[in-house]
């Protein structure tokens, strides 16, 4: 009897071990991937976030949508709308080039960098050459009107335009348009400017920064926000609170990302900080990641949103700051009446595109989202998609733009900068973050589910002989 | 008040150069154009040109170019006009005029100098 | 270069009748046309600016009509004090470009 019961026992004990082991295991495990995870995203010599912070093993395309005006003396002569057909994809690859001038700080724990800019262009995922013309606004022409509204020198900027034959619209190959040419107009300034522009211009052979962010290493919570952009903490360019650079690049994000959380980035091509709440669950090449997305309440005017009312810096072509879903950056841009918007005009007030046609907007295809992998913070997959406008007004004295009756905001071109990680990295990812958390997991479960089973399987074995037995 | 306030008449010999002062108050100057106008005894007026104080860009009669150089300081918000190698026939009434302006519409010369006369003579 | 033909070049006309004058432009301006008064001894005056509009301050009996090359200045019920000289101004391209002038004196 003895045996049997002491077996029983034993075994009741084992489960017991067994499942306070696992239940042990799961605080201890948290505890241990915690410790690794903090181990490994913070920013210095040695760690994996570093390796690829430093020169990110993704590669990253920009595609390009031209927008080809099929109307342009109709525009300049009876002020119809603009009638435009996009054209694309023109894809080049970029931020290939590893960060320049790395510096770690360690009095404030930060690392300071240049994020180099470079394209190469990729033929066999483009439509067309970079050759290739289109019929787009004359960037200098409407540029030029709006940074000197002065009629006198409106007057003298007309005899010039006229005198270099150039027109509202002009045409010009992608490469111009991106990267730079020299205006005709421009060149007969007698004083002096850049003559050469371009959507881009400059771009290779430029860097972003001096960025200095957190490396993490007195507190994970921090690790890759920003702490300071060109040597300071605000922008210049909005009023109050919209001035602020928030979060990280987007590249990455603190490790143990929460679904409720706001993921705060400041982005420099569109000169602000913005912000991506989450949508949904995704299984990326074997990886459980966050799908944070860009939402329309971003882009909504103050009347909608009232946190947007800094964004909102002047009254007349925002319909008093109720047109929404476009941002004006000229104070970015030395004056330069750009426009940034979601491709298409997405989320935009009507009043915005309705001197457009062709334009055709589309959640899937033009929203912007991140992919991260919520553990470590780390992007995994990306779509950055936004459009360039130009402003374009009438002009009293300069005759190209004297017959227009309305203001137009212009779109350009648009662009979908994209990033997924490889097949090998994620391999990679799966082995050393997801594998072995998934099988911690699995042994915790083992453990717990196999020790409840054979503790409460022997108790009542246990139990039901000491009864049979005092019968 | 907006006020122009010119230097006084100026008698030169042919051949040498005079430089008329434009002193402006009553208003921000870099902001308006400063332009210069001749009128030759009982003749009608002739621009001679103008200057953007903002960024100091200028634009020129051609007729002018090479008689007339155009200024501004800044700091003491005085437009100036160098006239060179003066002849009898450059003998006139010069004004400096501003674009200064409020209501609708885009005036040209609102405000006016007293004018200053340029006698040249041997 | 836009040349101005100013007309009549003078004019005596008894006060209160109206007064017309005329400016022909060689090239289309739209209505980039300007209207200055200059009393003796004065500077000239901007009585109308471009798109026919009448300056602050000044009298409604003085307005001006036209577009593109044909323009006319007009002051309805002459007064002894308008007597003075008449220039129009094209302000549509460089360089800038006077009228001959209008001399108007009164009966």
């Known amino acids: 009897g003895c045996d049997r019961n002491c077996g029983l026992i034993t075994g009741a004990v084992i489960g017991a071990v067994l499942a306070v082991f696992g239940g042990i295991l799961m605080p201890v495990g948290d505890m241990l991937i915690q410790k690794t995870i903090k181990k490994e995203v913070v920013l210095e010599e040695g760690t994996i976030a570093f390796k690829n912070w430093v020169k990110t093993g993704t590669e990253i395309y920009r595609q390009f949508w031209i927008f080809d005006v099929q109307n342009p003396q109709e525009v300049m002569m009876n002020s119809s709308n603009i009638q435009v057909k996009q054209r694309g994809p023109y894809t080049y690859r970029v931020r290939f080039l590893a960060k320049e001038n790395i510096t770690q700080d360690p009095k404030d724990n930060t690392v300071s960098f240049l994020q180099p800019n470079g394209a190469i262009f990729e033929p066999s995922l483009s439509v067309g050459t970079e050759a290739d013309n289109f019929t787009v606004l004359n960037l200098a022409v409407a540029a030029a009107s709006h940074i000197y509204p002065n009629p006198f020198v409106q007057v003298v900027l007309n005899s010039l335009i006229n005198k270099s034959k150039s027109s509202m619209f002009q045409v010009r190959t992608l490469r111009e348009l991106l990267w730079g040419y020299t205006d005709p107009f421009l060149s007969l300034v007698p004083y002096p400017v850049s003559t050469r522009v371009g959507m881009f211009y400059p771009y290779n052979n430029t860097a972003d920064g001096v960025y200095k962010v957190f490396n993490g290493k007195d507190s994970i919570s921090k690790v890759a926000i920003i702490d300071t952009y060109k040597g300071k903490r605000n922008l210049s360019y909005w009023e109050s609170y919209c001035d602020m650079i928030n979060g990280t690049d987007a590249a990455s994000f603190p490790p143990f990302v929460e679904k409720s959380q706001v993921l705060q980035f400041f982005s420099s091509d569109i000169c602000r900080s913005i912000y991506a709440v989450f949508e949904s669950d995704v299984n990326l090449k074997g990886i459980p990641v966050y799908r944070f997305v860009l939402p329309s309440k971003a882009f909504a005017s103050p009347v909608q949103n009232p946190d947007n009312h800094c964004f909102c810096t002047e009254k007349i072509i925002s319909k008093n700051c109720t047109s929404y879903g476009v941002l004006d950056i000229s104070k970015c841009k030395e004056g330069k009446p750009v426009y940034i918007s979601l491709p298409h005009f997405l989320y935009a007030s009507p009043d915005v595109s309705e001197t457009i046609d062709g334009l055709n907007p589309n959640e899937e295809e033009h929203r912007t989202y991140l992919d991260i992998e919520p553990i470590t913070g780390f992007t995994l997959q990306f779509a950055k998609r936004l459009q360039v406008n130009l402003l374009v007004k009438p002009s009293n004295k300069i005759q190209v733009l004297k017959r227009l009756k309305r203001n137009y905001i212009v779109p350009i071109l648009w662009l979908n900068e994209t990033g997924t990680i490889g097949d090998e990295k994620a391999k990679m990812f799966r082995s050393q973050v997801t594998g072995k958390i998934n099988l911690l997991g699995l042994i915790e479960m083992i453990l717990l589910s196999v020790g409840v089973v054979m503790f409460v399987a022997f108790m009542i074995s246990y139990c039901a002989c000491r009864s049979k037995t005092i019968k | 008040e907006v006020q122009l306030q010119q230097s006084g008449p100026e008698l030169v010999k042919p051949g040498a150069s005079v430089k008329i002062s434009c002193k402006t108050s009553g208003y921000t100057f870099t902001e308006y154009t400063m332009h210069w106008v001749k009128q030759s005894h009982g003749k009608s007026l002739e621009w001679i040109g103008g200057i953007y104080p903002y960024n100091g860009g200028t634009a020129y009669n051609q007729k002018f170019k090479n008689k007339a150089t155009l200024t501004v300081d800044i700091s003491s918000n005085t437009a100036y006009m160098a006239l060179r190698s003066l002849a009898s026939d450059d003998s006139a009434v010069y004004y400096c005029a501003s674009d200064y302006f409020y209501g609708d519409g885009y005036p040209w010369f609102t405000y006016w100098g007293q004018g200053t006369l340029v006698t040249v003579s041997a | 270069e836009t040349t101005v033909t100013q007309s009549p070049a003078s004019l005596s006309v008894a006060t209160g009748e109206k007064v017309t004058i005329r400016c022909i432009t060689s090239?289309?301006?739209?209505?980039?046309m300007n209207w200055y008064q200059q009393r003796p001894g004065e500077p000239p005056n901007l009585l109308i600016s471009e798109g026919n509009t009448l300056r602050p301050g000044v009298p409604s009996r003085f307005s001006s009509s036209g577009y593109g090359t044909d323009f006319v200045f007009t002051i309805e019920n002459t007064l002894s004090e308008d007597v003075a000289d008449y220039y129009c101004?094209?302000?549509?391209?460089?360089?800038?470009?006077f009228g001959s002038g209008t001399r108007l004196e009164i009966k």
């Open positions: 090239t289309d301006i739209d209505d980039d």
């Open positions: 101004l094209q302000s549509d391209n460089l360089p800038f470009t």
